[in-house]
Interface confidence: low
């Protein structure tokens, strides 16, 4: 349905709140140096705008697509050179190059300072003070740091942001009230961060191919109950959702999506028995908990796979009419079967049933071919079960940190070029796979495990994209999606690796370690231990320990110490010299 | 830039045995799982064998399964296929791959035929 003005229709779809929100988002997504009074200024002029096109469709420049609006809006900003070098070359190219161009240059990693939170009470006054303000600022400070934040999404956080501080400034201990639930919002914010992320690698690297095959497997195993054609529609849709989302196009991303949880709660009947409570929640709500809602109760009659795309003689007749229809009807079938199985897993079996039909339906007698082909399952389904369990009885008995640690080493071994800081990021991120999966009963443990994995792993590939450094990284990267972790799983101690010159300075600890949090200071040892495996590739795991025992020992002792800096610079001498001569460096 | 030559095709008598090789460089070898895939003339592709980085863990299609086994040589960049029992069906160009069962060829792969 075409409208006379794009940027009035969205005003008014989404209402002036919800339509500079999104605005913002977008700039800060694009723009992520700017400085947050910059986009403000730019966000009222735009909004303004959109306003005299709600008045009157017909105004100047209401016709214009969104992308040549808010473009040449960002090309006002006057110190784009200087701030973002090449990046301005964009503003020389007509849209849609212009757009892709902007996409392009957004940053995973940008050169930002980490957010420090303030005092509890400075900030309950800031709220109060202007909560406005506060508000935007936070939507501000996240899009810029997370480029390709699910922007909708985005919007229910800061809800919850609102309602946190809202709630608590006014409790007797606003410390005690506000804290837990920020570290929650941070934690979840990441994780959704990094969810989305996959999804745009997924459509922007592998094609809207790649992401619908993924779409139809998770939404078969979490509405079993609906029809292929019913998952096929939701599938297309949610597709539009997110290519808009990871493409700028904001806007439009945050009415499809409303549009598409209005479609669900009006047809819930035919969808799955689970959404009654999602859909009594307000918009924002209502989404993300569709979003996240628990798997559907799988009907208890379904026949078995075989008869249809095995033992059936007209396997190849289905296939060769329309074979996306027929790989997306199988992998629908098998995914609402098994909601035991990682999505990646589905999709993998699904590509071997693919590459099966293409080579059989070939063949002299096809269906002597592909008679086997579930059997060509059983390793595929028993990699990933192993692998599983194997890490869950490491993690048991390790726990998180030392389980941590062990990743750190496994990874840093594999592909040591890669940077200090993205390979403690990853591997802490890995390691969390315990403490997340884990406790969850077999059934559950692999779509846990495995497609958590893919999120973090989707980390490390879009960090080295940025700074390739790996060939081994980017052929796990690039080659193929749902092969991934088991391309990374299967590297072993890179040879290669001409070790890293010993470095005394990268060992040296001063007293401010003892004043931070454990976390940080988790990170401290944990970059250490890094650097030793660069150093040493072939320590052994006996040997890093003994080294890192020691580190933990020295640092707790001149944490205790009276003269803490004369402790880390006399004793620090001597555990660099120690362990210099464990490690035979 | 990685390359893969097979090597150790040739005529052979059905019941008879080949050793196939399959030097690889360019890349970590040591680091990948590896097949073996064959194309019979006419047909697709098929997979044959696979085995894990370590050389730990083997998989075969059911039609080779007892015949046919994989092995790797780490050291040497090398991945073997030892045929015994060879059928007419087994005459095809095989090759070898980098990854798992749904590994696609580079190579120029090396004819084996089975006739008598």
């Known amino acids: 349905d075409a409208h006379k003005s794009e940027v009035a229709h969205r005003f008014k779809d989404l209402g002036e709140e919800n339509f500079k929100a999104l605005v913002l988002i977008a700039f800060a997504q694009y723009l992520q140096q700017c400085p947050f009074e910059d986009h403000v200024k730019l966000v009222n002029e735009v909004t303004e705008f959109a306003k005299t096109c709600v008045a009157d469709e017909s105004a100047e420049n209401c016709d214009k697509s969104l992308h040549t609006l808010f473009g040449d809006k960002l090309c006002t900003v006057a110190t784009l050179r200087e701030t973002y070098g090449e990046m301005a070359d964009c503003c020389a190219k007509q849209e849609p190059e212009r757009n892709e161009c902007f996409l392009q240059h957004k940053d995973d990693n940008p050169n930002l300072p980490r957010l420090v939170r303030p005092e509890v009470d400075v900030m309950c006054t800031a709220f109060h003070d202007n909560e406005e303000t506060f508000l935007k600022k936070y939507l501000y400070e996240i899009a810029r740091r997370h480029p390709y934040f699910y922007a909708p999404e985005l919007l229910f956080f800061a809800k919850r942001y609102k309602a946190a501080f809202t709630e608590c400034c006014q409790a007797a201990d606003k410390a005690a009230c506000l804290l837990p639930k920020l570290d929650e919002l941070r934690d979840e914010g990441k994780a959704s961060s990094a969810k989305q992320r996959l999804k745009c690698a997924s459509l922007q690297k592998f094609g809207e191919r790649a992401f619908k095959a993924w779409a139809v497997a998770r939404l078969s195993q979490r509405f079993p109950k609906a029809e292929f054609a019913e998952v096929s529609k939701l599938v297309t849709d949610l597709t539009k959702v997110h290519t808009e989302c990871c493409h700028g196009d904001l806007l439009e991303c945050a009415d499809d999506r409303a549009d598409l949880a209005k479609y669900i709660c009006e047809n819930q009947d035919s969808i799955s028995s689970k959404l009654k409570e999602c859909c009594e929640k307000p918009l924002l709500e209502k989404s993300h908990c569709i979003a996240e809602v628990e798997n559907d109760e799988m009907p208890a009659d379904l026949p078995s796979l075989a008869a249809d795309f095995v033992e059936s003689k007209d396997v190849c007749k289905n296939y060769a009419e329309a074979k996306d229809v027929f790989l997306g009807m199988f992998l629908y079938e098998y995914a609402r079967r098994h909601p035991d199985y990682s999505v990646v897993l589905l999709l993998r079996l699904a590509k071997t049933y693919e590459t099966t039909l293409e080579k059989c339906c070939a063949a002299a007698d096809p269906h002597e071919c592909y008679a086997k082909v579930f059997d060509e399952f059983k390793p595929l389904v028993e990699e990933p079960q192993n692998l599983i369990k194997q890490n869950c009885e490491l993690f048991e008995q390790l726990g998180e940190y030392k389980f941590q640690n062990a990743l750190l080493v496994r990874y840093t071994k594999k592909v040591p070029q890669v940077s200090t800081p993205t390979l403690v990021e990853v591997s802490r991120n890995l390691g969390k796979v315990g403490s997340k999966c884990c406790k969850h009963p077999e059934a559950k443990r692999m779509p846990c495990a495995e497609d958590y994995l893919s999120v973090v792993l989707n980390q490390l590939c879009v960090l080295h994209e940025k700074t390739p450094v790996s060939d081994r990284v980017t052929k796990c990267c690039t080659e193929s999606l749902v092969n991934r972790r088991p391309c990374f799983s299967a590297l072993e101690v890179d040879e290669t690796y001409v070790p890293k010159e010993f470095n005394a300075e990268t060992f040296t600890f001063h007293a401010d370690i003892c004043t931070l949090s454990e976390k940080e200071r988790q990170i401290k040892k944990q970059t250490a231990l890094v650097e030793l495996v660069k150093h040493k590739p072939k320590a052994t795991k006996e040997q890093l320990k003994a080294v890192m025992d020691d580190f933990a020992a020295f640092v707790e002792k001149c944490c205790k110490a009276d003269d803490k800096e004369t402790c880390f610079a006399e004793e620090g001498k001597k555990l660099v010299a120690a362990s210099q001569a464990a490690l035979g460096l | 830039q990685v390359q893969l030559v097979e090597s150790g095709g040739g005529v052979v008598q059905p019941g008879g045995s080949l050793r196939l090789s399959c030097a690889a460089s360019?890349?970590?070898?040591?680091?990948?799982?590896m097949s073996w895939v064959r194309q019979a003339p006419g047909k697709g592709l098929e997979w044959v064998s696979s085995?894990?980085?370590?050389?730990?863990?083997?998989y075969y299609a059911d039609s080779v399964k007892g015949r046919f086994t994989i092995s790797r040589d780490n050291s040497k960049n090398t991945l073997y296929l030892q045929m015994n029992s060879l059928r007419a069906e087994d005459t095809a160009v095989y090759y070898c791959a980098i990854g798992g069962p749904g590994a696609s060829p580079s190579g120029q792969g090396t004819q084996v035929t089975v006739s008598s």
């Open positions: 085995i894990n980085n370590g050389g730990s863990d083997t």
């Open positions: 360019g890349f970590a070898f040591r680091g990948f799982g």
